[in-house]
Amino acid sequence: EPCVEVVPNITYQCMELNFYKIPDNLPFSTKNLDLSFNPLRHLGSYSFFSFPELQVLDLSRCEIQTIEDGAYQSLSHLSTLILTGNPIQSLALGAFSGLSSLQKLVAVETNLASLENFPIGHLKTLKELNVAHNLIQSFKLPEYFSNLTNLEHLDLSSNKIQSIYCTDLRVLHQMPLLNLSLDLSLNPMNFIQPGAFKEIRLHKLTLRNNFDSLNVMKTCIQGLAGLEVHRLVLGEFRNEGNLEKFDKSALEGLCNLTIEEFRLAYLDYYLDDIIDLFNCLTNVSSFSLVSVTIERVKDFSYNFGWQHLELVNCKFGQFPTLKLKSLKRLTFTSNKGGNAFSEVDLPSLEFLDLSRNGLSFKGCCSQSDFGTTSLKYLDLSFNGVITMSSNFLGLEQLEHLDFQHSNLKQMSEFSVFLSLRNLIYLDISHTHTRVAFNGIFNGLSSLEVLKMAGNSFQENFLPDIFTELRNLTFLDLSQCQLEQLSPTAFNSLSSLQVLNMSHNNFFSLDTFPYKCLNSLQVLDYSLNHIMTSKKQELQHFPSSLAFLNLTQNDFACTCEHQSFLQWIKDQRQLLVEVERMECATPSDKQGMPVLSLNITCQMNK
Amino acid sequence: QKQYWVCNSSDASISYTYCDKMQYPISINVNPCIELKRSKGLLHIFYIPRRDLKQLYFNLYITVNTMNLPKRKEVICRGSDDDYSFCRALKGETVNTTISFSFKGIKFSKGKYKCVVEAISGSPEEMLFCLEFVILHQPNSN
């Protein structure tokens, strides 16, 4: 069975084809090759000689037991080598020779028992080494690591490391890898020698499900003393053994680390006193809780020095009381409990993501809701009912505003966005908005992107609501049940590049409303009911137009519409997916491609 | 279409068939077997994925006695610092995991429940596997 040609001459997918040897019928130009799940078993030297241009090679689950000297010799362009799930028993000293450009080596679940004997010391370009799910017992980083000066990611998770000693990290003292991220999760740790991490600098350290008791966790974290880490991730996994007890003493040792960003990811334990618990983390710049349950929500009003707070997939009794002076970014998404938003006091806040919480807002939105006048980014998407009762007074700095898939009320009662002269991006898609007021978008003089799909208009008519949006470049009006539009609806949109009118109820096409759109490049009218043109004589679309989508409409392929059908043929160079432009009537022509039609009509004198 | 039996409990019998061409082997055990009136137990899965499990989600199509419920999307792996350790599993890596579950207080009517589980993962998104579970429910069968 042949390999699948994914990208001609470049990418080949040969997965699970029962190959016993490397295929030699693929082009020399192959750059990406997936040979996974084939019983190759043995790699002799120069095994991939017929792939001189190869960049990515996937050999996952190929039952490889032996890799000879120079097996990959000649692959000087290879950047990624994946060996996941091979029961390697014999790995020659020169197994990886010739890989002068290798950046990523994945040797997950390959029976690797030690880093010491892993022959990769010459791979100077290596950026990522993944040796997770192996049998490694010692965390001693071999001397050859001093050659791996580009290493950024080292994944040692799911191994058998129990202890870390001062001598294990000696090589890092010799050549501090300033950018190294280290994952030690799911190793059964019970001892970290104090001083082992002294004066070590890491970009990221991840320790999840490493400790089988509170005491072990406490002493191991104390053993991290002296570490300087940009991002520290602690926590557990839902499907692994969890700590039976967790209290403030667990994290006391963190006072002896220098941490820029902290994340606690999943804890099967109720956090009740976060002030004491995170006492050593009051001055990290970024603090993050993922999948934890928080009992006392008032604690977030304590004077933490965080600049970024992230609460994701957590459980709360009610919406937390947030009073944090220094906070610039708040991400509060996919949380449960506390369905009603209550005011927060965050005077420095610039970025606020409150999406996907099912929250309801009794009144939105003004400075008093968020306690800030500095807000630039606000995401309230995928929430409940949001009642618009103020037009963003005090929030004039906003540049990005997203309400999609929330239920907006009172949108047509006043100019909701009047204050937002700096707004660049607005998404009110699928918000149950019924446009019944022409001043709905007044004030949005800087707006570039407007997404309002899935809403509706009074009498299914698009009025002149865009008159102030002179900087608009993208407009989505799809799925709005529109049947007609004002001939001057788009007259002020001279910068508009993309207009999506798809999935509406237009029965005819007219070029007149688009005559002022001098920058228009994409016009999508697919999934309407267009049968013919509004007027007998259709003019040309703006000369800037490059893509016109008229697919899945109800074209009437009859003599009375001959001029319209001819006009469509004249637009051939603009049309996309022409094979999906089919006649709907008459019945004998139903399903026929419009462009292949040859209508010759007799003119009655 | 070969049917794979999972388990029987006092009020339910559970089995599954594959609804994809590939039919990559997957081993599923539930201990103790699910009782629809209330249940607490462990789900054990042994599987070798044909693609990375990063950003894994399930599309669930549930049918109750021939009546179709709306499609449900259950996101399992978001893509970073996920709840489940298997979210970091790579293509070709053994996934051997036990997940605890519990539910209570749901009254199910007697009949045949079908649940098509479409597992989607990776970037670009592609189907990982598709299983159709059949649960025959006999309330108070003892």
Partner: nanobody, 112 residues
Framework: EVQLVESGGGLVQAGGSLRLSCVAS????????MGWYRQAPGKQGESVAI???????YYPDSVKGRFAISRDNAKNTVYLQMNSLKLEDTGVYYC??????RGQGTQVTVSS
């Protein structure tokens, strides 16, 4: 056991020509991917010519138009014709059978 013996190397002036030969034993080469790989001191090794069993050939840009690989299955031999040689063509040239190994190599030195 597969054995590959190269010959034809030597010292040649820039602009000159050489023809390398490689005789294989312990294997029938007709179904094998074969070629030449060169290693110059202090430089990254590179494949300079590859020939498949169907006769299709590959050359990197650095030798394209100057080198030509051919095979004689009856003689179990593969050849490399090198014309318009340049100083940077200096190195040890190894005969390769993909997945089987290489010979001991033959030295090619191009002088000015």
């Amino acid at each position: 056991e597969v054995q590959l013996v190269e010959s034809g190397g030597g010292l040649v002036q820039a602009g000159g020509s050489l023809r390398l030969s490689c005789v294989a034993s312990g294997i029938t080469i007709s179904t094998e991917v074969m070629g030449w790989y060169r290693q110059a001191p202090g430089k990254q090794g590179e494949s300079v010519a590859i020939i498949k069993s169907d006769g299709s050939t590959y050359y990197p840009d650095s030798v394209k138009g100057r080198f030509a690989i051919s095979r004689d299955n009856a003689k179990n031999t593969v050849y490399l014709q090198m014309n318009s040689l340049k100083l940077e063509d200096t190195g040890v040239y190894y005969c390769i059978i993909a997945g089987r190994g290489r010979g001991q190599g033959t030295q090619v030195t191009v002088s000015s």
